[in-house]
Interface confidence: medium
Amino acid sequence: MMTGTIETTGNISAEKGGSIILQCHLSSTTAQVTQVNWEQQDQLLAICNADLGWHISPSFKDRVAPGPGLGLTLQSLTVNDTGEYFCIYHTYPDGTYTGRIFLEVLESSVAEHGARFQIP
């Protein structure tokens, strides 16, 4: 039975040219996190494997940095980075938990963070 919940940074906005941290946190479960996949729509951005470490897609290597923790830092943001991002937690024995973050990259300097929310 899957009892865990994923808390994410929710709907967030950031300024073009700036950087943003995508963060998810798995709670309410004792399951072991074996791997976290970060995906943008259907594209795999990065992997953090509990044993094998961080691996970043070549397409994003110049603009994506691992961490903090199991999170992901996006740098040199462009308007094209606007969209949905998913953190996929592979756990044992529970299975897979998925969190969703929507990022809006703004041209203006008025970029405010959205509220945190939970996905059961």
Epitope: T34, Q35, N37, E39, D42, L44, I47, N49, D51, L52, W54, H55, I56, S57, P58, K61, I88, H90, T96
Partner: nanobody, 121 residues
Framework: EVQLVESGGGLVQPGGSLRLSCAAS????????MGWFRQAPGKEREFVAA?????????NYADSVKGRFTISADNSKNTAYLQMNSLKPEDTAVYYC?????????????WGQGTLVTVSS
């Protein structure tokens, strides 16, 4: 599921070198993160090194082998390698090759059967 077969183990003197190979079949290395683990007698299996062809050959190493071991992969031969230099008696262990599936929605390892490395004079 990918099948992995290790080779290259053996007896070597302290300070010597060995090169382990891990031949994969049933899948392409570029679809996996390849890792080497080892298990010494009476101890738990531990991470040694990893490489991902998918991420442009990103490599990670355990602190205990940094600067001595080098992991590499030849996608055309579907084989991963572990070059081990400056071997120490404490490197004695069974070395296992592992493939971690990382495509969206997948998880877990496929394991080889292991190859024994003994470092002794």
């Amino acid at each position: 599921e990918v099948q992995l077969v290790e080779s290259g183990g053996g007896l070597v003197q302290p300070g010597g070198s060995l090169r382990l190979s891990c031949a994969a079949s049933g899948g392409t290395l570029s679809s996996y993160i390849m890792g080497w683990f080892r298990q010494a007698p009476g101890k738990e299996r531990e991470f040694v090194a990893a490489i991902s062809g998918w991420s442009g050959g990103t490599t990670n190493y355990a602190d205990s082998v940094k600067g001595r071991f080098t992991i590499s992969a030849d996608n055309s031969k579907n084989t991963a390698y572990l070059q081990m230099n400056s071997l120490k008696p404490e490197d004695t262990a069974v070395y296992y090759c592992a493939a971690a599936r990382f495509a969206p929605g997948s998880r877990g390892y496929d394991w080889g059967q292991g190859t024994l490395v003994t470092v002794s004079s």
